[in-house]
Amino acid sequence: QQQTLPKPFIWAEPHFMVPKEKQVTICCQGNYGAVEYQLHFEGSLFAVDRPKPPERINKVQFYIPDMNSRMAGQYSCIYRVGELWSEPSNLLDLVVTEMYDTPTLSVHPGPEVISGEKVTFYCRLDTATSMFLLLKEGRSSHVQRGYGKVQAEFPLGPVTTAHRGTYRCFGSYNNHAWSFPSEPVKLLVTGDIENTSLAPEDPTFPADTWGTYLLTTETGLQKDHALWDHTAQNLLR
């Protein structure tokens, strides 16, 4: 006899990285017929939704209209069908960004390199932080973590055309409070004579897209929660 229901999916829209004072929606998708959804924040009950009619709804949305450091942290959700509760969802790490200062991102030997060359990114921030994060824009969130008093190194090693793309970095004041993003650095790797454009699985976005930190496309989020659960979120574990 089944004692619990399958765990729901949890994700954030437009993204788990939320600029301070901006709105974010935490989505929890369970099963049709669920009479109650609970959102937990840092282990305590945060919000409850009892959708009506339950048989026509399998996803609820919990809005946070004004993101701040108090609201940053780990969220999970559960749902209930009759008296039977689900397993808890995976943890969603909600990060507040645009805190305090802006780091500087540079690349050595330069932004235009030949395939096979060794490339290192440097992220510098003079305020009190010792953890830095390098993110590559694209369909999935490629994130690296680095440490240093005011600067962290991110060696990419010998690069290939797959490394082409736009990079930004953050300083991290704690796991859930990050700085403003650096200005972007576009890495161009030559060596693929046939095709010098970006790889199709790693598209660039319009310049304003970064404003909402859509490192993963919304359609991608909605279609593949497993991808969402296991990309950039893993860096916070």
Epitope: Q23, F46, A47, V48, D49, K52, Q61, P65, D66
Partner: nanobody, 130 residues
Amino acid sequence: EVQLVESGGGLVQPGGSLRLSCAASGRTFSRLPMAWVRQAPGKGLEWVSAISWSGGSTYYADSMKGRFTISRDNSKNTLYLQMNSLRAEDTAVYYCAAVGDSAPYSATIVYTDARAYAYWGQGTLVTVSS
């Protein structure tokens, strides 16, 4: 912007009743989930009860279940808390609170954590004593 003003507090004997009111100004009141939160002397904030913007969903802290009733009248922009069977440990300043007003909230959602609330009244003191 939402302004909240509580009233109805006072001195009551154990076992007695009180009805708190919270008058709201601002056009968005009828679309905001709300709550009552209290703070006992020398203690931290304690969430009491919450209600969805439609009034159709309510939620109570365990120690208030069966004794307190939260309700709202959106036509009057007013939130209420009916408190029965009051105990000495219910002595506190009671605050009404509303979530931020820039989101399309579900008609059935309630927020059960004080950190979710952006707007707060100045509070009304309830003293339960013989």
